[in-house]
């Protein structure tokens, strides 16, 4: 079957590399400086993406694989691929269309991106305030006020390891 | 391949509560918000409220407070809304829906939908 | 509470440019996002962040927004971008959507 197809299309025996050059009767040509295809068959080569600006290199091209960018200090990527940088803000702030603003009392902000977003209002859960919220920390809701009894004491969770917006990308 | 599956389809009767299921796979729960949003018959779309899957924090739209309870459990990677005393109006598809990277509000991954009918 | 307000119908024949706008007060200092929904199915992100477009959606969607007045945009219009369109908001702790537009295909 392999040996049918490859006399229908001598073009599917090129590698991931090279290309099916039209103009050479279609011998694979490896793909000229700057360009790659990263499966084979391919009848053209497709551009580089160049990381600049903002933009910095995180893989850098190969024969067979786009060039990976991220984003220079400061700056986060977002879209598919790191499509965009967006400025950092500090936490206990929020990027708005005119820069970086401070959270409003009641509401925080624990990343360097995204919204300030309102405290957690632990009594709607049916439980109670164990550690004050602030610009850049939820509060941390504990048990309802109904299991505080006296002389009872209630420990503070471990900050967590990783939240929303830290995963890898 | 990242999915967002939720539980099935329930009837309930007027007064009671229901709980919806929304099961993630594919990306790290913890990591993005989620949200629930539901849909009434041939209405339009209606935010109830937030989970932060890494403090279990949560955020819910003034109309269902004191009503609705956004939950999740890590260790299954799923996120639970359950609405009380249901009345008929509450009839409608519930989606949950995943809060995308930028952490702006933009929903870039919704469940298939779970339909609640409360009828007597 | 703030209000979005969408035309509830916008027909355009297949080839032309549809605009489907969302209005609001002093919508351009906000962020808006933007879905479709088809018939029976959840609704998908076309346009986040006033104008950017997550991978998957063609380029045939943008968007605008500044003022009063965010806009959806779709040019060369198919028969498969009939749908309901919604916009989207955040505005003082809650998440608020357009009542949606219904985009017909003629």
């Known amino acids: 079957f392999e040996r049918t197809r490859s006399l229908q299309d001598p073009c599917s025996n090129c590698p991931a590399g090279t290309f099916c050059d039209n103009n050479r009767n279609q011998i694979c040509s490896p793909c000229p400086p700057n360009s790659f295809s990263s499966a084979g068959g391919q009848r053209t080569c497709d551009i580089c993406r160049q990381c600049k600006g903002v933009f910095r290199t995180r893989k850098e091209c190969s024969s067979t694989s786009n060039a990976e960018c991220d984003c220079t200090p400061g700056f986060h990527c977002l879209g598919a691929g790191c499509s965009m940088c967006e400025q950092d803000c500090k936490q206990g702030q929020e990027l708005t269309k005119k820069g970086c603003k401070d959270c409003c009392f009641g509401t925080f902000n624990d990343q360097k991106r995204g919204i300030c977003r309102p405290w957690t209002n632990c009594s709607l859960d049916g439980k109670s305030v164990l550690v004050n919220g602030t610009k850049e920390r939820d509060v941390v809701c504990g048990p309802s006020p109904a299991d505080l009894s006296p002389g009872a004491s209630s420990v503070t969770p471990p900050a967590p390891a990783r939240e929303p917006g830290h995963s890898p990308q | 391949q990242m999915q967002l599956v939720q539980s099935g389809a329930e009837v309930k009767k007027p007064g009671a509560s229901v709980k919806v299921s929304c099961k993630a796979s594919?990306?790290?729960?913890?990591?993005?918000?989620m949200h629930w949003v539901r849909q009434a018959p041939g209405q339009g779309l209606e935010w109830m409220g937030w989970?932060?899957?890494?403090?279990?924090?949560?955020n819910y739209a003034q109309k269902f407070q004191g009503r609705v309870t956004i939950t999740r459990d890590t260790s299954a990677s799923t996120a639970y809304m359950e609405l009380s005393s249901l009345r008929s109006e509450d009839t409608a598809v519930y989606y949950c829906a995943r809060e995308g990277m930028a952490m702006r509000l933009e929903l870039d991954k919704w469940g298939q939908g779970t339909l609640v009918t409360v009828s007597s | 509470s703030y209000e979005l307000t969408q035309p509830p119908s916008v027909s355009v024949a297949p080839g032309k440019t549809a605009r489907i706008t969302c209005g609001g007060n002093?919508?351009?200092?906000?962020?808006v996002h933007w879905y479709q929904q088809k018939p029976g199915q959840a609704p998908v992100l076309v346009i986040y962040?006033?104008?950017d477009r997550p991978s998957g959606i063609p380029e045939r969607f943008s968007g605008s927004n500044s003022g009063n007045t965010a806009t959806l945009t779709i040019s060369r219009v198919e028969a498969g971008d009939e749908a309901d369109y919604y916009c989207?908001?955040?505005?003082?702790?809650?998440?608020?959507f357009g009542g949606g537009t219904q985009l017909t295909v003629l």
């Open positions: 962040y006033d104008s």
């Open positions: 989207q908001v955040w505005d003082s702790s809650s998440v608020v």
């Open positions: 594919g990306y790290s729960f913890s990591g993005y918000y």
């Open positions: 002093n919508i351009g200092s906000k962020s």
């Open positions: 989970v932060n899957p890494m403090s279990g924090g949560t």
